[in-house]
């Protein structure tokens, strides 16, 4: 049940009066604000709407809104020496030229400073040679090249269609199997749903559209010049040299007409299987090389994009909390886009605006949350989260002792079809109550409770009747928040009903025809997807700023630590006689675990009786729930990964979009039957075992009876 | 040491199945490609398809139409080729082999189709 | 489909002598050709790769040569053991093709 106890309340001014105020049509105007003109990033379009947005937060009637500018790395292509990629016969001339800009979409002719397709952070290159086509890039399709198709990429540029995982990732696989170059291409299997035309008549990528991206490995760091500390005036900045994540290889994005005249050439070896071919009109050969006749064609790269450190602004409004304005709950998403920014992320911008104006507007009722609400619009998340992670080690010190939660608010959409919710277990049950009390925006569950149809469409895995709430892993603002703080974290949106495709985007992510109009004729014409986001994403927001017991359960935490114990423990399995040998136990994780489940369910008893009109015990009740996430925390970080300090869950190491559960034992684990010292590798997993079950045996502990 | 263990011989009539194991060890089975190879009385190598253990993903040979189907059970490692509406024609020795390059096979499984 | 054609049918070679076969392919599949070993009463064994490496633990008599369409197994010093059916394969393209074998006999 919702709460309403902050102070000058009057009856009205709950969560209702809040939730009532949230209008689709508000929502609507503000993104076509938004999508106008192009918002990269470091530029001054993106600069002018800071300053917009900061002017009308103040309007809308917060507390005070401030820019915080940092300077980071960024990157952009050359203005006078494009980039791309072509085929050259056998006395270097060019046969083919990949184009070196999106036709742009209609109504857009005349926009300037539509930044052409590039890979962020590439170095510069021009490399030439045989190409390779590696599927996906992932790490079991360079397993699947190198060990048992026998093919080195050593010296070769590789070929990947962009998909299933982080496109940072797929460039670090291709660095590691020693390749020169990397070409990354939308296949129309991936980007093309059948059925569907293709962008302005529909909202499919046309073969001339292009994914931008950056294709770093930063593990967490922020800007690459400044790791753990932000990137303020009297900054030291690490040379070039010693940048975090980096690529060592010239990368560039192409779109599907272009890989055609690359991939109709490939000879080689034919394709492993099925799951390796796309859709294009192609045989999908792996190479290395072109075919017969196109045998002494080579494929040469010219990439010339400059790194260069650059001014960001971030806005952060607060709006101060009556009773406890030292506790804050986050709601923050980004406002820099690779171009109009129509989905990502101007439809989570067009989002947090209207809560900010519902909340304003209650606060010029005379309301005010309990706990402090900060509203940022943070730069640069396309280049790295650079804004969000910057701030967060600005304010590192406040955020680790003050920090309740962190909702995040990019992309509001990438799909129509039910909600989808990433999120710490702590929130699962504020999650479920919260949309069981919105109506469903959803054809055929008119009437319907949100929790219904998203139940409907996208059910439990485990728990039947429940609907499905993944881990979070990263890949976006939250990042910092979660996996470096530990600050309890959640994000949700609409999305599409294509699980097999998660992590791939909508067909035209990151491209020029990311436009306002893509989603006001193709996805939501009445903005009631957005309206039910902004429902669950504000009232994530007023519950855990106003609850006067923070509405979070550590019982959900307990039962997903079983799962996933489990689940570790089945992957450990699968050696059973290398753990005979190494004597690699489990028993002290399950035993920390077992711990964890009974101090929470007492903890969950004394929550229900203790005396709430106390405010010393409500605070000290209400702070071993939002340090719980933080006692997650090993400070010295994972192994690698210093900034990636969460123990129960990490981004994927194979993909950065991906949440993994118990990462250090997983990342130990994996791949292990290939390791040259067995010793020492089941060591390493011995150690991360015992890491994983201390941490979990000091958590349970914080939930313990004080004295 | 890498060892692919098949099923013992088969006799079937004309219009049966015949679903054919091959129990993997000795390596990472999701890693290797699994092909199933057959080979007539004293005749040439004819290759009927294949599947990536770790995905499921697989190619067929055309000639089979639909005819054969395979299929792995990782948590066993074993891969298995199963061929329907068999013929007088289908007998032969049935091979797995592990790897792209066929770098390992199994003992081969006689399929005699008589009527 | 692309057809292997292998020559000689087969081939009778005096112990320590050389023996040539030749795989040819209906059309270009660059180096994408293996050669196996079939032993009487055996499975076939995996000898060459990518149309010249060897495979792990064959002797270096064996060698792999071509591209292209044409390509040859040479075995430089024949030995009793090495008595079987070699077979050439293609992987360049779906279905994947085997020639109808070369079987080298001692003279």
């Known amino acids: 049940k919702s709460s309403n106890e902050a102070t000058n309340i009057t009856p009205k001014h709950n969560m209702k009066a809040f939730l009532d105020e949230l209008k689709a049509e508000n929502i609507k105007k503000f993104l076509y604000n938004f999508t106008q003109i192009p918002h990269l990033a470091g530029t001054e379009q993106n600069f002018q709407l800071a300053k917009q947005i900061q002017s009308q937060w103040k309007e809308f009637g917060l507390d005070s809104v401030e820019l915080a500018h940092y300077d980071v790395l960024l990157s952009y292509p050359n203005k006078t020496h494009p980039n791309y990629i072509s085929i050259i016969n056998e006395d270097g001339n060019e046969i083919f030229n990949t184009s070196l800009f999106e036709p742009p979409p209609p109504g857009y002719e005349n926009v300037s400073d539509i930044v052409p397709p590039f890979s962020a952070f590439s170095p510069q290159g021009m490399p030439e040679g045989d190409l390779v086509y590696v599927n996906y890039a992932r790490t079991e399709d360079f397993f699947k090249l190198e060990r048992d198709m026998k093919i080195n990429c050593s010296g070769k540029i590789v070929i990947a269609r962009y998909g299933k995982v982080f496109r940072g990732n797929k460039v670090k696989n291709a660095q590691l199997a020693g390749a020169k170059g990397v070409i990354l291409y939308s296949d129309p299997a991936d980007y093309f749903a059948p059925g569907v035309k293709s962008y302005p008549d529909g909202w499919n990528l046309p073969g001339g559209g292009v994914q931008r991206g950056n294709i770093l490995n930063l593990n967490g760091a922020g800007d690459p010049l400044t790791p753990g500390y932000p990137a303020n005036e009297y900054a030291y900045r690490r040379g070039i040299a010693e940048a975090v994540g980096l690529p060592s290889i010239p990368v560039h994005p192409i779109g599907y007409y272009d890989a055609q005249k690359l991939l109709e050439k490939m000879g080689g070896s034919a394709p492993p299987d099925s799951s390796w071919r796309g859709s294009l009109k192609v045989p999908y050969n792996v190479g290395p090389g072109f075919t017969g006749n196109f045998s002494t064609q080579k494929v040469k790269m010219h990439i010339h994009s400059t790194n260069e450190v650059t001014r960001i602004y971030n806005v952060i409004g607060t709006l101060r909390g009556a009773v406890e304005p030292d506790r804050y709950v986050i709601l923050g998403g980004h406002r820099d886009s690779w171009v109009f920014g129509g989905i990502d992320p101007q439809s989570g911008a067009a989002v947090v605006h209207e809560i900010v104006r519902s909340f304003g507007t209650l606060k010029k009722e005379g309301w005010r949350p309990r706990r402090t609400i900060l509203f940022a619009s943070w730069d640069a998340e396309e280049f790295g989260l650079l804004g969000s992670t910057e701030w967060a080690e600005e304010n590192s010190r406040l955020l680790q002792e003050r920090g309740v939660a962190y909702i995040n608010a990019d992309s509001s959409i990438e799909g129509n079809y039910t909600l989808r919710v990433d999120c710490t277990p702590l929130m699962y049950s504020l999650v479920h109550n919260l949309t069981k009390e919105l109506k469903s925006p959803d054809e055929g569950f008119e009437g319907k409770s949100l929790y219904e149809s998203w139940t409907k469409k996208s059910p439990s895995p485990e728990f039947s009747g429940m609907p499905r709430i993944s881990k979070l892993g990263s890949g976006n603002d939250f990042e910092v928040f979660f996996q470096r703080l530990g600050i309890a974290s959640g994000r949700a949106r609409y999305t599409k009903n294509w699980e097999t495709n998660k992590f791939s985007g909508y067909p035209l992510y990151h491209s020029v025809y990311e436009t306002y109009e893509l989603v006001e004729k193709f996805y939501d014409p009445m903005f009631k997807y957005h309206l039910t986001v902004a429902q669950v994403r504000g009232g994530m927001v007023f519950e855990l700023a106003n609850s006067i017991v923070l509405p979070f359960d550590c019982r959900d935490y307990a039962v997903v630590l079983r799962k996933y114990a489990d689940k570790i423990y089945s992957i450990s399995m699968k050696h059973p006689q290398e753990m005979k040998t190494y004597s690699v136990s489990f028993d002290s994780l399950f035993s920390a675990v077992k711990n964890f489940t009974e101090i929470a369910s007492k903890f969950s008893e004394r929550l229900q009786d203790f005396d709430k009109s106390n405010p010393i015990v409500l605070r000290m009740m209400n702070d071993q729930l939002m340090f719980l996430e933080r006692a997650f925390i090993d400070p010295l970080g994972l192994p690698d990964r210093p900034f990636y300090r969460h123990v129960i869950y990490a981004p994927s190491s194979h993909n950065k979009y991906a949440g993994e559960s118990f990462p250090g034992i997983y990342d130990a684990l994996f791949d292990i039957e290939s390791k040259v010292d067995p010793s020492k590798a089941w060591g390493e997993v011995k150690r991360q075992i015992y890491v994983a079950a201390f941490t979990v045996q000091a958590a349970a502990e914080t939930l313990s009876e004080v004295a | 040491e890498v060892q692919l263990v098949q099923s013992g011989a088969e006799v079937k009539k004309p219009g049966a199945s015949v679903k054919v194991s091959c129990k993997t060890s000795?390596?990472?089975?999701?890693?290797?490609?699994i092909h199933w190879v057959r080979q007539a009385p004293g005749q040439s190598l004819e290759w009927m398809g294949n599947?990536?253990?770790?995905?499921?993903?697989?190619t067929y040979n055309q000639k089979f139409q639909g005819r054969v189907t395979i299929t792995v059970d990782k948590s066993t490692s074993t891969a298995y080729m199963e061929l329907s509406s068999l013929r007088s024609e289908d007998t032969a020795v049935y091979y797995c082999?592990?790897?792209?390059?066929?770098?390992?096979w199994g003992q081969g499984t006689l399929v005699t189709v008589s009527s | 489909d692309i057809v292997m054609t292998q020559s000689p049918d087969s081939l009778a070679v005096s112990l320590g002598e050389r023996a040539t076969l030749s795989c040819r392919a209906s059309?270009?599949?660059?180096?994408?050709v293996d050669w196996y070993q079939q032993k009487p009463d055996q499975s076939p064994k995996l000898l060459i790769y990518?149309?010249?490496t060897r495979h792990t633990g064959v002797p270096d008599r064996f060698t792999g040569s071509g591209s292209g369409t044409d390509f040859t197994l040479t075995i430089s010093s024949l030995q009793a053991e090495d008595v079987a059916v070699y077979f050439c394969?293609?992987?360049?393209?779906?279905?994947?093709?085997f020639g109808a074998g070369t079987k080298v006999e001692i003279k």
């Open positions: 082999a592990a790897g792209w390059n066929f770098d390992y």
């Open positions: 394969q293609q992987r360049n393209s779906y279905p994947l093709t």
């Open positions: 599947i990536n253990p770790n995905n499921g993903g697989t």
């Open positions: 000795g390596y990472t089975f999701t890693e290797y490609t």
């Open positions: 059309q270009d599949v660059g180096t994408a």
């Open positions: 990518w149309a010249s």
